[in-house]
Interface confidence: medium
């Protein structure tokens, strides 16, 4: 038997993805766990199999079919639950019905890139990946810029409250290094969270013109 | 594991109805798959009716369709069986049965056993 607190979290990336951790206070070792998927109006279901990521902590991803294929829809409830083998037997662990645009982590944006890089701004784009087309323009963005000699944690946050693929950073320093990140989420879903952060995009701005007098 | 206590069963004429109840307490009811088993007397105990942890799936013995509803309240740590039509062949000592094993529906080897409540079906 296991005893402790067990917590079970989910989040669908819109598309065909949900991705889960199971966390349990004095868990098991050495022992099979699966994450078992069964919707209400699907034909299909899904497994994967839970692997460590910490001392209490297993997570895995449920790939319900091709990245962009739009697998579930706002009135799908899937029930999760996280099965253990004992012996012969798979053994409830947890269970939840999980409501999928409730409960929304896109992916982290890609292919960011510098459009026009000057000496005091820095304009970027990037693009969204395998977001639902559900969505429309309702998405908001938050971005980054790592300046020399601080941390990304000391980064403020600049936010674009609509769907805009692309930024202009002003103020910056001439021939100066920097990295640039952004994340994205949708305004629906009550459980709704940021996508990760992006890979970050280092850019160097442009020296400041050399006086005549120099 | 969970303990269970069941209540409601007694003495009905045939035709008429009951409604078991069985508590739960101890662990996290909404992982159980829960049934209700019954045994009469001088034969072995006998599947009646399950419902899976979600509530989404339910089983019956064939001799019981249509006459009996099994149905949980996760919130209220609750599994009931609706008898209507009641038969003197229902007469028995009936058992509530919690189990984690997922794929284990019928099987007589579920982890949890209640006391068992006695329903009586006079002709």
């Known amino acids: 038997a296991v005893n402790g607190t067990s917590q079970f979290t989910c989040f669908y990336n819109s598309r065909a993805n949900i991705s889960c951790v199971w966390s349990q206070d004095g868990a098991l070792q050495d022992t099979s766990c699966q994450v078992h998927a069964w919707p209400d109006r699907r034909r299909w279901n899904q497994t994967c199999e839970l692997l460590p990521v910490s001392q209490a902590s297993w997570a895995c991803n449920l790939i319900l079919g091709a990245p962009d294929s739009q697998k579930l829809t706002t009135v799908d409830i899937v029930t999760l639950r996280v099965l253990c083998r004992e012996g012969v037997r798979w053994r409830v662990m947890a269970i939840q019905d999980f409501k999928p645009f409730e409960n929304l982590r896109l992916m982290a944006p890609i292919s960011l890139q510098v459009v026009h890089v000057e000496t005091h701004r820095c304009n970027i784009s990037w693009e969204i990946s395998q977001a639902s087309h559900y969505f429309e323009r309702h998405l908001e963005f938050e971005a980054r810029t790592l300046s020399p000699g601080h941390t990304w944690e000391e980064a403020p946050l600049l936010t674009l409250k609509q769907k805009q693929e692309w930024i202009c950073l002003e103020t910056l320093t001439p021939d100066t290094q920097y990295e640039f990140q952004v994340r994205v989420k949708p305004l629906q879903g009550e459980f709704t969270t940021w996508s990760p952060w992006s890979q970050p995009l280092a850019f160097r701005t442009k020296p400041a013109a050399l006086g005549k007098d120099t | 594991e969970v303990q269970l206590v069941e209540s409601g069963g007694g003495l009905v004429q045939a035709g008429g109805s009951l409604r078991l109840s069985c508590a739960a307490s101890?662990?996290?009811?909404?992982?159980?798959?829960m049934a209700w088993f019954r045994q009469a007397p001088g034969k072995e105990r006998e599947f009646v009716a399950s419902v899976t942890d979600s509530g989404r799936t339910t089983d019956y013995v064939d001799s019981v369709k249509g006459r009996f509803t099994v149905s949980r309240d996760n919130a209220k740590n609750t599994v009931y069986l609706q008898m209507n039509n009641l038969k003197p062949e229902d007469t028995a000592v009936y058992y509530c049965?919690?189990?984690?094993?997922?794929?284990?529906?019928?099987?007589?080897?579920?982890?949890?056993w209640g006391q068992g409540t006695q329903v009586t079906v006079s002709s």
């Open positions: 049965a919690a189990n984690t094993d997922y794929f284990q529906i019928r099987s007589l080897e579920f982890n949890t």
């Open positions: 101890g662990d996290v009811f909404v992982r159980y798959t």
